[in-house]
Interface confidence: medium
């Protein structure tokens, strides 16, 4: 049997026998283009492709449309994998999205969506989510129906303001909505009453900026 040498996601890597968390090279669907991603092989059975991670404020998330499209940061630390890759990947197969959150008081919570995909760039990478479960709120902090993605140089939100410019970071802003995991990073003791922080409203309420976040995806049939 010929060994698989290209992988489209971390689930394929896990199933190939590589079960250690770390940075791996993934290949765009129907292409030879490659991208580096962090694979979490430990959480909930492993095989998770990490598409976003915040932990210390070391990376600036107030980036352009092009940067959010292509990805930025370091997969070993804070990073955004890239909207184009995620859109192509989730358009080929049914994926689940898990969002892990940490506050500054040592608490952890998660939201799990049983179907997640991003529309293509022509639809501004609009987010589609269904089937919320988890401990980070009974109501989705990503507005439903899904919004278009907005950045500081591409305003696609439903607000009379420009959410990305005001709240910082690229996100699926509504008007401006109950979440922004790409907001300004605030250290402990400076993380409350912050309108432009890392927000997940239906877990921590208004103005609370989180300590750490991870967004990761895995095939629904893993």
């Amino acid at each position: 049997k010929e060994e698989q040498t290209t992988f489209r996601d971390c689930a394929e890597i896990f199933k190939s026998g590589l079960t250690t968390s770390g940075i791996y090279t993934l290949t765009f669907p129907n292409s030879t283009e490659e991208i580096k991603a962090y694979c979490d092989m430990d959480v909930g059975g492993g095989g998770w492709t990490v598409i976003q991670h915040r932990e210390d404020g070391s990376v600036d998330f107030q980036r352009t449309w092009k940067e959010y499209k292509e990805g930025f940061g370091s997969p070993l630390g804070e990073y955004w994998l890239g909207n184009e890759f995620v859109s192509q990947l989730t358009g080929q197969h049914r994926y689940v999205l898990k969002i892990q959150l940490k506050d500054w008081e040592g608490n952890e919570a998660h939201s799990l969506y049983d179907h997640f995909y991003l529309a293509g760039e022509e639809s501004n990478y609009r987010i589609h989510l269904t089937g919320l479960t988890g401990t980070a709120g009974k109501i989705s902090s990503i507005s439903q129906p899904g919004s278009d993605f907005s950045t500081k140089d591409s305003d696609n939100d439903k607000c009379i303001c420009k959410c990305s410019q005001m709240l910082s970071g690229g996100w699926w802003f509504d008007a401006c909505g109950p979440s922004n995991l790409n907001g300004q990073y605030y250290p402990q003791k400076q993380n409350t009453n912050k309108f432009n922080g890392i927000k997940w409203y239906y877990w921590k309420g208004s103005g609370y900026s989180l300590k750490a976040t991870t967004m990761m995806i895995r095939p629904a049939d893993f």
């Epitope: 439903k158 509504d174 008007a175 401006c176 208004s206």
Partner: antibody, heavy 120, light 111 residues
Framework: QVQLVQSGAEVKKPGSSVKVSCKAS????????ISWVRQAPGQGLEWMGR????????NYAQKFQGRVTITADESTSTAYMELSSLRSEDTAVYYC?????????????WGQGTLVTVSS | NFMLTQPHSVSESPGKTVIIPCTRS????????VQWYQKRPGSAPSIVIY?????PSGVPDRFSGSIDSSSNSASLTISGLKTEDEADYYC?????????FGGGTKLTVLG
């Protein structure tokens, strides 16, 4: 629990201006948008505009553009709505309102209303 | 900008169910959340449904909201009508130009 307390009733002459205040307590005033909505006698609710105090940015409904000015004073947690060139059709109850969610365009908390009567 | 159209009035007997529709004139009803407000004479409006179907704490579960993409409309349903439900009801949505209210529906509880 956010509370909004508005200034008292006003009687104004046509062509003049009115300034209504709205004092907030029990929440984070700066980062929550304050909207102004009016209801004329026998009419429905009409959104006029809003301000995000922390940014000092106001947005107005097209109908009122150029005639309404919404401001906020963070030090006193007070928002203001000034309407100029008053005419009889501006006779209405004016409400300030806000949301428990920063900026979101729906309105969980309302002031008690301020009656503005425009009459010669 | 889009408009939200509601019937001018509806009436029903106590204990019955009433449905108040709100039709969006252009753009999808699903593209922005719909809220519903109750307005009694002499009082400020109060929100009874937000985000299409969520009910704020303190609002009885007799009140429910829904949206129907096929008719491009939202609906407020009040079951087990009580006399205190008599009021004006307004739907509300928004887009990148601002907030839009429906014209309001006067609910009369008969008897």
């Amino acid at each position: 629990q956010v509370q909004l307390v508005q200034s008292g009733a006003e009687v104004k002459k046509p062509g003049s201006s009115v300034k209504v205040s709205c004092k907030a307590s029990g929440g984070t005033f700066s980062s929550h948008a304050i909207s102004w909505v009016r209801q004329a006698p026998g009419q429905g609710l009409e959104w006029m505009g809003r301000i995000i105090p922390i940014l000092g940015i106001a947005n107005y409904a097209q109908k009122f553009q150029g005639r309404v000015t919404i401001t906020a004073d963070e030090s006193t947690s007070t928002a203001y709505m000034e309407l100029s060139s008053l005419r009889s059709e501006d006779t209405a109850v004016y409400y300030c309102a806000t949301s428990r969610l920063e900026w979101l365009l729906y309105l969980d908390y309302w002031g008690q209303g301020t009656l503005v009567t425009v009459s010669s | 900008n889009f408009m939200l159209t509601q019937p001018h009035s509806v009436s029903e007997s106590p204990g019955k169910t009433v449905i108040i529709p709100c039709t969006r004139s252009s753009g999808s009803i699903a593209s922005n959340y719909v809220q519903w407000y109750q307005k009694r004479p002499g009082s400020a409006p109060s929100i009874v449904i937000y985000e299409d179907k969520q009910r704020p704490s303190g609002v009885p579960d007799r009140f429910s909201g829904s949206i129907d993409s096929s008719s491009n409309s939202a609906s407020l349903t009040i079951s087990g009508l009580k006399t205190e439900d008599e009021a004006d009801y307004y739907c509300q949505s928004y887009n990148s130009r601002g907030v839009m209210f429906g014209g309001g529906t006067k609910l009369t509880v008969l008897g």
